[in-house]
């Protein structure tokens, strides 16, 4: 009978303690958001947000530009200055809650926890293979916004997910925010909304469609928006929320919410429970 | 949505949607290239240890999700409507029964049942693609890509590692592209992952790391046989006494056969 080498067990054929060094960038603070841009002409960028700062990196992860996004009320805040002379709200650190691209312009949109959750639009300016941010535009029109009706209040300090959808020659922001009673009372960002960016980049159109957790449920019913994406004719949000309005709020489950990406309205808003199991 | 048995993992931790490669598509009974939503689920908010694995991965084909939703709308709005079927979403709108709009007893003739938000009455159930093999690993980030018709899950973990694993219905082991530590800090990899060209960007603590989609290298494959069985997209070959990519090998680099074992 032919003698054969004994088989090496599968686990013994690999070593996961092997060290690999991959390129990295040290942001100088906990990374809060990150988004990448790839242009048609070989230009690309990585945008990295930390508390009070936005870094622009080249494709090699080297720093190209850095912008102060806070603290609000600080004279060094470059985004705040775009809104004109202040004060615009209570002073405080800016945690970036939203960092998305509007590919049509193209532009980067950043929204933070300060200044009522307003957003800033930064046009992208290609420079060779790198990209720079133009001076920010403040997406906030003071005369359009009130605590109970604020089209320009986008980000919630408790977390916000945004997916940008192009319809015709316009950009619609599909926004989902976690709320509680305090956030809802102060320039409420709404739970789910569809907002249209104004042509002059002065904010979002005053009429927008929205759904919000009803005031009586705000204390006990909290929705976490985990992920959002656009594919085909729909935008989807993934949530973790209590299974019932009336039962134990700690009994959580996962839902998928579906919105039309072709009609900016919420009449065909649908939710479906996603159930994932381990069957030993 | 199928399986009711098994241990529920109700809390979604991270998710990503991507078109799938041929093998996984066959296993999911869908066409290659169709979009699938992948989610990493845990048992509770703290993701603490239960009886089973810490994290499980479920796959939800988007077309199936849409079909289930559309069927749910039909159940609510097309007669005969099952009595007692609720429109749901009582946290957003006044309670009502199908086919009535929220807060109204009956439909007015010019109001369409379909023009109001709805919670579909059935759920979509799936089972862990990895059959529990993630074990104690707590997955905190997920990005799915298709490479040479192979569907790969790129996962970040609570202890700062990256796992790149083929997404197939696992039998008794995971098919690793790689499993390595991002650095020495051991901080959790954050939820959001971005792609730039052939690289993925993961954040951990105050660092951003650029990881090749094809994997960081081949040195973790210890035997020539294992090295040459690695996926084609990894570009591995045997290089004297180690597994490496061609650029790492000054001498002979072999992709088609192993030296005889003595």
């Amino acid at each position: 009978e032919d003698w054969q080498c004994p088989r090496t067990p599968y686990a013994a054929s690999r070593d996961f303690d092997v060290k690999y060094v991959v390129p990295s960038f040290s942001a100088g603070g906990l990374v809060q958001a990150m988004v990448t841009y790839e242009g048609d002409r070989n230009e690309s960028a990585v945008f990295v947000a930390i508390r009070n700062r936005l870094h622009v990196l080249g494709p090699d992860l080297k720093s190209v530009q850095s912008l102060a996004t806070g603290p609000a009320g600080d004279p060094g805040c470059q985004t705040c200055a775009a809104c004109g002379p202040g004060p615009h709200g209570p002073p405080g650190d800016t945690d970036t809650k939203v960092l998305v691209l509007d590919p049509a312009l193209p532009a980067l949109v950043s929204c933070g926890s300060s200044l009522q959750g307003r957003c800033f639009l930064h046009d992208l300016e290609p420079q060779g293979t790198a990209v720079h941010l133009a001076a920010p535009a403040c997406l906030f029109s003071a005369h359009h916004n009130r605590p109970d009706d604020c089209p320009d209040c986008v980000a919630s300090p408790l977390g916000t997910r945004v997916t940008v959808v192009e319809q015709g020659q316009a950009s619609y922001f599909y926004v989902a925010s976690s709320l509680d009673a305090a956030v809802a009372a102060s320039f409420s960002p709404r739970s789910v909304s569809i907002r249209r960016l104004k042509a002059d980049a002065s904010g979002f159109a005053p009429g927008f469609v929205a759904l919000s957790v009803l005031p009586k449920h705000l204390v006990s019913y909290s929705i976490e928006y985990v992920h959002s994406f656009h594919t085909g004719a729909f935008v989807y949000f993934l949530t973790v929320q209590p299974a019932s309005v009336t039962d134990d709020p700690s009994a959580l489950h996962t839902r998928l919410a579906r919105l039309s990406a072709t009609e900016p309205e919420l009449g065909d808003y649908r939710e479906l429970v996603l159930d994932c199991r381990f069957a030993p | 949505g199928a399986p009711e048995g098994g241990q529920p993992y109700p809390v979604l931790r991270v998710a990503h949607s991507a078109p799938v490669g041929a093998q996984l598509a066959t296993e999911l009974s869908i066409a290659e290239g169709q979009e699938v939503l992948f989610g990493v689920f845990v048992t509770g908010k703290d993701g603490g240890p239960g009886v089973g694995p810490n994290s499980v991965v479920c796959a939800f084909p988007i077309d199936l999700l849409d079909t289930l939703i559309d069927e749910g709308v039909e159940r609510c709005c097309e007669s005969p409507v099952h009595p007692g079927l609720r429109r749901g979403l009582d946290f957003f709108q006044s309670p009502s029964f199908c086919p009535n709009p929220p807060g109204l007893e009956a439909l007015s003739p010019n109001t369409s049942c379909r023009h109001f938000p709805l919670l579909v009455s059935s759920s979509f159930s799936r089972v862990d693609l990895f059959n529990g093999l993630l074990g104690p690993v707590q997955v905190t980030a997920l990005y799915v890509t298709r490479l040479d018709n192979v569907t790969v899950a790129h996962m970040g973990t609570m202890d700062g590692r990256i796992l790149q694993v083929e997404l197939v219905r696992s039998l008794n082991y995971l098919l690793y592209v790689s499993n390595f530590s991002l650095g020495d800090s051991g901080q959790p990899v954050q939820r959001d992952v971005s792609r730039l060209g052939d690289h993925l960007l993961f954040a951990s603590g105050d660092q951003v790391f650029q990881v090749p989609i094809q994997g960081p290298g081949c040195r973790h494959f210890l035997t020539c046989g294992r090295c040459l069985r690695a996926w084609h997209f990894m570009g591995c070959g045997w290089c004297g006494n180690m597994c490496g990519q061609q650029k790492e090998c000054p001498g002979s680099w072999q992709q088609d056969h192993c030296p005889p074992k003595l």
Epitope: G39, D40, R41, P103, A104, L105, P106, P126, P151, E166, G168, Q169, A170, R196, L197, K198, A199, D200, A205, P206, G207, F208, P264 | -
Partner: antibody, heavy 117, light 111 residues
Framework: EVQLQESGPSLVKPSQTLSLTCSVT????????WNWIRKFPGNKLEYMGY???????YYNPSLKSRISITRDTSKNHYYLQLISVTAEDTATYYC???????????WGQGTSVTVSS | DIVMTQSPLSLPVTPGEPASISCRAS??????????MNWYLQKPGQSPQLLIY???NQGSGVPDRFSGSGSGTDFTLKISRVEAEDVGVYYC?????????FGGGTKVEIK
């Protein structure tokens, strides 16, 4: 300064294809929307269609079966093709840029096309 | 398609005097709290230039004497004090529905 320049034949025979080029300088056609509009004798303006930053197109349904708008990003050019032309297609053809909502802020100088045998 | 009707067809003006042009849409062109109405001027021998977008916003480099107003279906372009260089054909354009459609034009000429 953004500039657009139309070019192409000024005379096309009936049933043939009208082909025009719009050359763009001062901006990249990989951002915004790039439109074609025509003006008939008697001043009537008709919107024809656009190609977007991503290459997506929209065509006026009245022209849908005959029109095609394409682009070459390496040249920063975009193109109009109108097949099976008739005398009714005699017009001055303009290319124009819009950033948002079909508000066209930069226009070419226009090129006059006559359809005649 | 939305039909845009401009009046008057022709408008003789005196330099230094105000002038106004009306545009009516066959259906409401407002949505999301915005009026999707743009105004253009085509001077003799030139291509059209954007004067006003979203009913009341001035285009880049447009003199302050041009203003737009209106909502729903009725819109107005006003020139506070006409100058000789303002002659040409003025067009309104709706962009709420595709295809975008233009008015028939108003020819402004010096008396």
């Amino acid at each position: 300064e953004v500039q657009l320049q139309e070019s192409g034949p000024s005379l096309v025979k009936p049933s043939q294809t009208l082909s025009l080029t719009c050359s763009v300088t001062g901006d990249s056609i990989t951002s915004g929307y790039w439109n074609w509009i025509r003006k008939f004798p008697g001043n009537k303006l008709e919107y024809m269609g656009y190609i977007s930053y991503s290459g997506k197109t929209y065509y006026n349904p009245s022209l849908k079966s005959r029109i095609s708008i394409t682009r070459d990003t390496s040249k920063n050019h975009y193109y109009l093709q109108l097949i099976s032309v008739t005398a009714e297609d005699t017009a001055t053809y303009y290319c124009a840029r819009s950033k948002y909502d079909y508000a066209m802020d930069y226009w070419g100088q226009g090129t006059s096309v006559t359809v005649s045998s | 398609d939305i039909v845009m009707t401009q009046s008057p067809l022709s408008l003789p003006v005196t330099p230094g005097e105000p002038a106004s042009i009306s545009c009516r849409a066959s259906e409401i062109v407002d949505n999301f709290g915005i009026s999707f109405m743009n105004w253009y001027l085509q001077k003799p021998g030139q291509s059209p230039q954007l004067l006003i977008y979203a009913a009341s916003n001035q285009g880049s480099g447009v003199p302050d004497r041009f203003s737009g107003s209106g909502s729903g279906t009725d819109f107005t372009l006003k020139i506070s004090r006409v100058e000789a260089e303002d002659v040409g054909v003025y067009y309104c354009q709706q962009s709420k529905e595709v295809p975008p459609t233009f008015g028939g034009g108003t020819k402004v000429e010096i008396k």
